[in-house]
Amino acid sequence: LKGQEFAPSHQQVYAPLRADGDKPRAHLTVVRQTPTQHFKNQFPALHWEHELGLAFTKNRMNYTNKFLLIPESGDYFIYSQVTFRGMTSECSEIRQAGRPNKPDSITVVITKVTDSYPEPTQLLMGTKSVCEVGSNWFQPIYLGAMFSLQEGDKLMVNVSDISLVDYTKEDKTFFGAFLL
Amino acid sequence: LKGQEFAPSHQQVYAPLRADGDKPRAHLTVVRQTPTQHFKNQFPALHWEHELGLAFTKNRMNYTNKFLLIPESGDYFIYSQVTFRGMTSECSEIRQAGRPNKPDSITVVITKVTDSYPEPTQLLMGTKSVCEVGSNWFQPIYLGAMFSLQEGDKLMVNVSDISLVDYTKEDKTFFGAFLL
Amino acid sequence: LKGQEFAPSHQQVYAPLRADGDKPRAHLTVVRQTPTQHFKNQFPALHWEHELGLAFTKNRMNYTNKFLLIPESGDYFIYSQVTFRGMTSECSEIRQAGRPNKPDSITVVITKVTDSYPEPTQLLMGTKSVCEVGSNWFQPIYLGAMFSLQEGDKLMVNVSDISLVDYTKEDKTFFGAFLL
């Protein structure tokens, strides 16, 4: 094969090619969360396993202090699943003046932090009312989409209530990203 | 274009390049499951359509006997959706000594089987309590993530109750994987 | 690096290589929907933001009139999340002659339209019964999978009830596709 055979017939100029195997990638899995202070109106961030079991980071994609650090600019597919579990939410039974009360809910947010930008950016949100009847409950929220990220961006997963996160199995709650 | 123009400026040595179009890929769609006995404590595996309609396998990714066979080592994105449907779950109505009973649930697991390893590995799990009130119910569980797989690994989708799987439409229940 | 070094040892002939950065990609985000007529038995299509905030289209992937237009043939990963919200569905409380009535439901369909083919093709469907008790409710449906598409194919997202779609935040309801 000669180099020029890689050029498609319409002679479009491409950016430099690179092997797929060296692209930044990470799949992080749940660990038991340590109790931490977080501000009342701010969803706490989960921390993650990055090297044991199914978890890995590779090709300069690093995990540190609840953040995935983006090592190069480009379009990334980012995903997470958080499995929640809890005791019965009695929201259906408690009514004030005969009208339904505000439902309990569970929420996952994948957030981007850019040091040069004051506010974090919410990339993805999955939010669900929980108004279960008659027993304990458990359910996952899954998110995934593509975003244009810059070198140095940091990604984290925030949840509405850290105490409801199922941390028991690495296949139930996870977080990942890969350069496309 | 000359071959050396593919080399990025920082002269990093890359693995051999390859065209994206020749990477192993598969998208499998639901079929009606054949009556089979399965062990009480083991989730049965679904079998799939691999060539009709929206389904396909390509580039040495083969489907056989409920398994997707991984033809080369690398990082794969793996996904599945299973739509469940059922008649009312009565868990909210039956109480023992006034306390809620264990809820019914629906579960999907994407499992990896490696011949050299005695136990299957659960890669992904979506599990949800089902405690519906007053009517038929239906709902999907979606899963997707990236894993490092080895040539010869086999992937399957297991469900908690095969009789609850909606097999009626190829867009409701599906399973796929592709090399990144 | 010489061009022939890209040829793997088994001498397989690959399709032309191309840089990942020039592949067609889009991530669209929710906007408030304008009231439009749609046929009674046909799910209405959502329209989308394609350039503000997190939304983008690139490399000849264009958005026009509710459709993503596929600019070149290949295997694409397609995804969408729609967050629904509504007032209590009373389906569990209204019974006819002691039997539960048909449940309310929410449905998302990712549809492909091919001009040369008379009928749209449903690629992905997420459908869920909604039989909530005692309060307002909200919940997402997420879909994603890989499909072989042809140049000129058009993709859209249809929903069962446009008035239930949460259009308030770009991270809650979105639609995207990228060439693998």
């Epitope: - | 079929v31 054949t34 008649m87 109750d161 009789s163 | 039997r99």
Partner: antibody, heavy 119, light 111 residues
């Protein structure tokens, strides 16, 4: 309107095979699974299996596995059920039935085909 | 092996109400698709009366209704008519996806 018309009565010897046909009309043949159900004289209904005419996929009741084969000819919108190694207890009326996809109930039935197995 | 059990026979006078029960030996019967009911009049093929416990196909009179309680399903016929005489079968699926029929119930309309 939907119709399933079955082939006529058959008399077979023990050990032989029988092939019963079921011609569908009034709907898209490939869009609905066909089931086969039999009823021995004076007895109840017994399910034998299902056939997807589009893919050719089948599912058989354990009792009949290895002896029954269900096939479809899409060009003629006809489903077939072949039962081999016949014995006297296979004497029955054999019905084809079209399914409701959502519930797998048997919505439309053929008129039945009497198969008598006698030496 | 799962079983659906029906009473062998029931009877009632014209205008009366009769109920036929169908009890499952296993909790997973009907979980996915519910229980269906069929009417077989003498010398004819079965006819679908009720699907998914409750639902009447078009053309089935509203004298026929289905219900469910626990692991049992029931078919109720009100305003019994002489032409209702025949056999009635319940049907569902077990956890292995095999279809099961009940043994059938012979309905006799007295008088």
């Amino acid at each position: 309107q939907v119709q399933l018309v079955q082939s006529g009565a058959e008399v077979k010897k023990p050990g032989a095979s029988v092939k019963v046909s079921c011609k569908a009309s009034g709907y898209t043949f490939t869009s609905y699974d066909i089931n086969w159900v039999r009823q021995a004289p004076g007895q109840g209904l017994e399910w034998m299996g299902w056939l997807n005419p589009n893919s050719g996929n089948t599912g058989y009741a354990q009792k009949f596995q290895g002896r029954v084969t269900m096939t479809a000819d899409r060009s003629t919108s006809t489903a077939y059920m072949e039962l081999s190694s016949l014995r006297s207890e296979d004497t029955a009326v054999y019905y084809c039935a079209r399914e409701v996809p959502e519930t797998a109930a048997f919505e439309y039935w053929g008129q039945g085909t009497l198969v008598t197995v006698s030496s | 092996q799962s079983v659906l059990t029906q009473p062998p026979s029931v009877s009632g006078a014209p205008g009366q109400r009769v109920t036929i029960s169908c009890t499952s030996s296993s909790s997973d019967i009907g979980a996915g698709s519910g229980v269906h009911w069929y009417q077989q009049l003498p010398g004819t093929a079965p006819k679908l009366l009720i699907e998914g416990y409750y639902n009447r196909p078009s053309g089935v009179p509203d004298r026929f209704s289905g219900s469910k309680s626990g692991t049992s399903a029931s078919l109720t016929i009100t305003g019994l008519l002489p032409e209702d005489e025949g056999d009635y079968y319940c049907q569902s699926y077990d956890g292995t996806l095999s279809a099961l029929f009940g043994g059938g119930t012979k309905l006799t309309v007295l008088g």
